[in-house]
């Protein structure tokens, strides 16, 4: 960057090289060039010469003043007009940054995705800081009082093997950058309560000709958790509102859920699960599209395959659930 150039003088920023966005700042340039008494000192921002708000402080120093500086990053350098030199002489350069101190991290969440071998902790970092901001995740055993710290710039994956202090922990997040430091509230967790089952996936769908045509959705998960609660939501692609069905599920076999849908309509389905009675849900599965037929023939769809026809499918066991309407987005 600009900071690696050989300097014939000094450039500095007040109040600091990294400062709060919107502040008034002063950039000072001091020449120290052999046999050059600068007639003029010039400032450049991102390679463009500044023409205003420059004040000569003394024989070798000038100040450039900015009001309400809003750029997240800028490269500044200054030059001297030396008599008897045919071009400007570079004095020095500096990269400057503006941004914000971190907000207090909130919505700290730690989950263990089944089979991952990690505890994944995330949080809401708040507003964009624009500058390098680091996070320290503190994990303290409530049984041994031993505390571990993990440095990251976003979320953190902590190996469950490293969590040797029992099952109960306090977790909190400290955010810090050049402009400030904040700390979240403490989250109390029990490792058995934060496991999220292996992802549920919709594999295919079929519409069966009957007195009233019905659509069967086939879905499964590789989870070994015995008691799992799931939700399937669906809607016509033209609708805003989701319908939600709830299931108590045993994944020893492929799940089949039946729906009575309008003919000749394109629908979208998603599923998610949680360990029954626990706090955290899986994220909603990928969108699965299925178009119901106009009339008699059977139609089958597979994940990400739209409007696929198939007449030779039979129905195995059916799992039924309770129908609700849902306007919610994804919930963690």
């Amino acid at each position: 960057g600009i900071t690696n150039i050989n300097c014939s003088g000094h450039i500095w920023v007040e109040p600091a090289t990294i400062f709060k966005m919107g502040m008034n700042i002063s950039i000072y340039c001091q020449a120290a060039i052999k046999n050059c008494q600068p007639r003029k000192l010039h400032f450049y921002k991102n390679g463009i010469k500044e023409r205003f708000q420059i004040t000569r402080i003394n024989k070798t120093t000038a100040r450039l003043w900015y009001k309400n500086f809003l750029e997240p990053h800028a490269s500044m350098y200054c030059t001297a007009e030396c008599p008897k030199h045919f071009q400007e002489t570079l004095i020095c350069g500096k990269d400057i940054s503006s941004g914000y101190p971190p907000d207090i991290p909130d919505e700290v969440t730690c989950v263990i995705y089944e089979y991952s071998g990690n505890m994944t902790c995330t949080w809401n970092a708040g507003k964009l800081t624009y500058i390098d901001t680091k996070y320290v995740v503190h994990v303290k055993s409530l049984e041994t009082e031993e505390e571990q710290q993990y440095l990251t710039s976003s979320y953190i994956n902590i190996s469950t093997d490293s969590l040797q202090g029992g099952k109960k922990y306090l977790v909190w997040v400290q955010a810090a950058n050049a402009l400030g430091m904040e700390e979240s509230k403490q989250l109390q967790i029990h490792l058995d309560d934060i496991v999220i089952p292996s992802a549920a996936v919709i594999s295919r769908a079929e519409t069966i000709n009957a007195t009233v045509p019905k659509t069967i959705i086939y879905w499964d998960s590789q989870t070994t958790i015995e008691k799992v609660s799931c939700e399937m939501r669906y809607k016509a692609t033209t609708n805003q509102t989701w319908n939600v069905k709830e299931f108590d599920t045993n994944f020893t076999y492929v799940q089949q859920s039946e729906f009575y849908l309008e003919p000749n309509i394109k629908y979208v389905f998603q599923v998610r699960c949680q360990e029954t009675g626990k706090r955290y849900w899986q994220p909603w599965s990928s969108l699965f599209f299925h178009k119901t037929p106009e009339t008699v023939p059977q139609v089958t769809s597979k994940a990400f395959q739209h409007d696929t026809w198939n007449s030779g499918l039979t129905v195995a066991s059916i799992s039924t659930g309770h129908l609700t309407s849902d306007n919610r987005g994804d919930i963690g």
């Epitope: 007639r39 024989k59 008599p83």
Partner: antibody
Amino acid sequence: QVHLVQSGTEVRKPGASVKVSCKVSGYTLNELAIHWVRQAPGKGLEWMGGFDPEHGEIIYAQRFQGRVTLPEDTSTDTAYLDLFNLRSEDTAVYFCATEAAPFDYWGQGTLVIVSS
Amino acid sequence: DIQMTQSPSTLSASVGDRVTITCRASQSLSSWLAWYQQKPGKAPKLLIYKASSLESGVPSRFSGSGSGTDFTLTISSLQPDDFATYYCQQYDIYPRTFGQGTKVEIK
């Protein structure tokens, strides 16, 4: 264009002090390094001191150290030479000059006569 | 301090002559050397800087050469206005020092 105008002839007794002024125009004093050079009657040029822009300080010739100061008044763009404890051998023409490395503009000179 | 030695001290020449003045430094200056012309009762006038660069407005009959410790001022064809005293000056280090001067007079 730089223009340097110096004060007029001064007559002093040995042991006295003298203040010679050098008024700058065309540029401000903040944009110029002023140096002082003297020339005794019939002799060569002798550098006395001036501002070194590389180190941001006034440097004096060893033989004048402690007997000369080079103050400046940036509000009036005037540089001064203060010479103390005058001796008869200080009789000379005193020049201010701008150092753009080298001295490219000179004042007209100020004659200082030290005589009892 | 760097000692600057000019030669000759006095030089008698005629209009149209080619005149050469030399200046020797007691240590290397790179190219930080200037030449001045001074007439009686006047301030010195810069002719050459950085050993060989001609100051703006100075006639091209003046030229400078050399580097390190040995430098030369040449007037290719002496004119009536050129009869004066010439000084070299080093501006490599402080204190700045001048040669003792070379007086060019009419033969």
